[in-house]
Amino acid sequence: MKVLQEPTCVSDYMSISTCEWKMGGPTNCSAELRLLYQLVFQSSETHTCVPENNGGVGCVCHLLMDDVVSMDNYTLDLWAGQQLLWKGSFKPSEHVKPRAPGNLTVHTNVSDTVLLTWSNPYPPDNYLYNDLTYAVNIWNENDLADSRIHNVTYLKPTLRIPASTLKSGISYRARVRAWAQHYNTTWSEWSPSTKWYNSYREPFEQR
């Protein structure tokens, strides 16, 4: 049994790190493999992660962590029974993929403005809580070429756009993702999208 592609891991910098790797041939990951991980900090216990299959030769493991500080380093040992297949380490703060924002809501009760709000996926005691910036993707359901990205570089998880910049009488969808600048993270996954109907009409004089 051989590792074809060594484990690579990303952390949500809160409670889960996800490691993926590829084996040399078809493998029943959960039956044949175990990924052991241990925080390099005094008297930290060794935890065992049971991997799941991710395609024929791919495996994925979700490492659970109680908290994270920037200096954390974990040792990783991939075992097949009594055989050590791979040994490595992982520093969560250097491989951060933020959690996706949630609760994306569109408010259209102000006649000439579309207000989008969403929730920061981190609690206030997490370093990323005050470090996230967002990208909001808005697109026309009937015309995928009519799509735009709004970068939200301020902390407040809201975006206001003039309704007049969207086509009238059309259904739009929006989704949002996040990244954290200080940790130079990758982008999060997109949030689930939300849909609304743009009923805005230009004032008669402007038609």
Epitope: M14, F41, Q42, D66, D67, V69, M71, P123
Partner: antibody, heavy 116, light 112 residues
């Protein structure tokens, strides 16, 4: 052996400022969050705030925002807390505690007495 | 802020008898990561507090097995199966799930 050794007792006048220290041995403070807990005479424990010593990121209980300032010097493996505009209500024992991710290690406490 | 309410506030127990302390939180203390950071600390006379139980049920290393924690949601309990003279002091519950973290007001245990 893990130890948190705090600076000695202080007597201060109202309006003054005090800075107390907490030196860690047996572990690196960069590997933990360092917290401060207040205990007024004959009273219970009150969480004040914490710091991630690596990046200096602090968070405080609203009651202590503006009153306490928590800092850390990773080169000397020491956390600090400064209390400003002291009043008689600030008379208490202040404990530093490392949390990873529970309060396993406590300093011996520093008594700050505010008296005119 | 989450308020942690302990009952009783004082307890007088005969050595060898059981003791139970209740802790109720004003709202759920399940962290966003799914864990419940409910801890119990004992402050013996003249000493700093010491950790007994973490994450509701887990005994910290070196803590005698006569101490046990239980509960979920907003109701938690610390039990001492047979109280010993060295168990005297003030017991505090603590939630470390939501900022600001908060302690209960303490329960004083004395020996009859």
């Amino acid at each position: 052996e893990v130890q948190l050794v705090q600076s000695g007792a202080e007597v201060k006048k109202p309006g003054a400022t005090v800075k107390i220290s907490c030196k860690a041995s047996g572990f690196n403070i960069k590997d933990t969050y360092m917290h401060w807990v207040k205990q007024a005479p004959g009273k219970g424990l009150e969480w004040m705030g914490r710091i991630d010593p690596t990046n200096g990121y602090t968070i405080y209980a609203s009651k202590f925002q503006g009153k306490a300032t928590i800092t850390a010097d990773t080169s000397s493996n020491t956390a600090y807390m400064e209390l400003s505009s002291l009043r008689s209500e600030d008379t208490a024992v202040y404990h530093c505690v490392s949390r990873r991710p529970w309060f396993a290690y406590w300093g011996q406490g520093t008594l700050v007495t505010v008296s005119s | 802020d989450i308020v942690m309410t302990q009952t009783p506030l004082s307890l007088s127990v005969t050595p060898g008898q059981p003791a139970s302390i209740s802790c109720r939180s004003s709202q759920s203390i399940v962290h966003s990561n799914g864990n419940t950071y409910l801890e119990w600390y004992l402050q013996k006379p003249g000493q700093s507090p010491q950790l007994l139980i973490y994450k509701v049920t887990n005994r910290f290393s070196g803590v005698p097995d006569r101490f046990s924690g239980s509960g979920s949601g907003t109701d938690f309990t610390l039990k001492i199966s047979r109280v010993e003279a060295e168990d005297v002091g003030v017991y505090y519950c603590f939630q470390g799930s939501h900022v600001p973290y908060t302690f209960g007001q303490g329960t004083k245990l004395e020996i009859k």
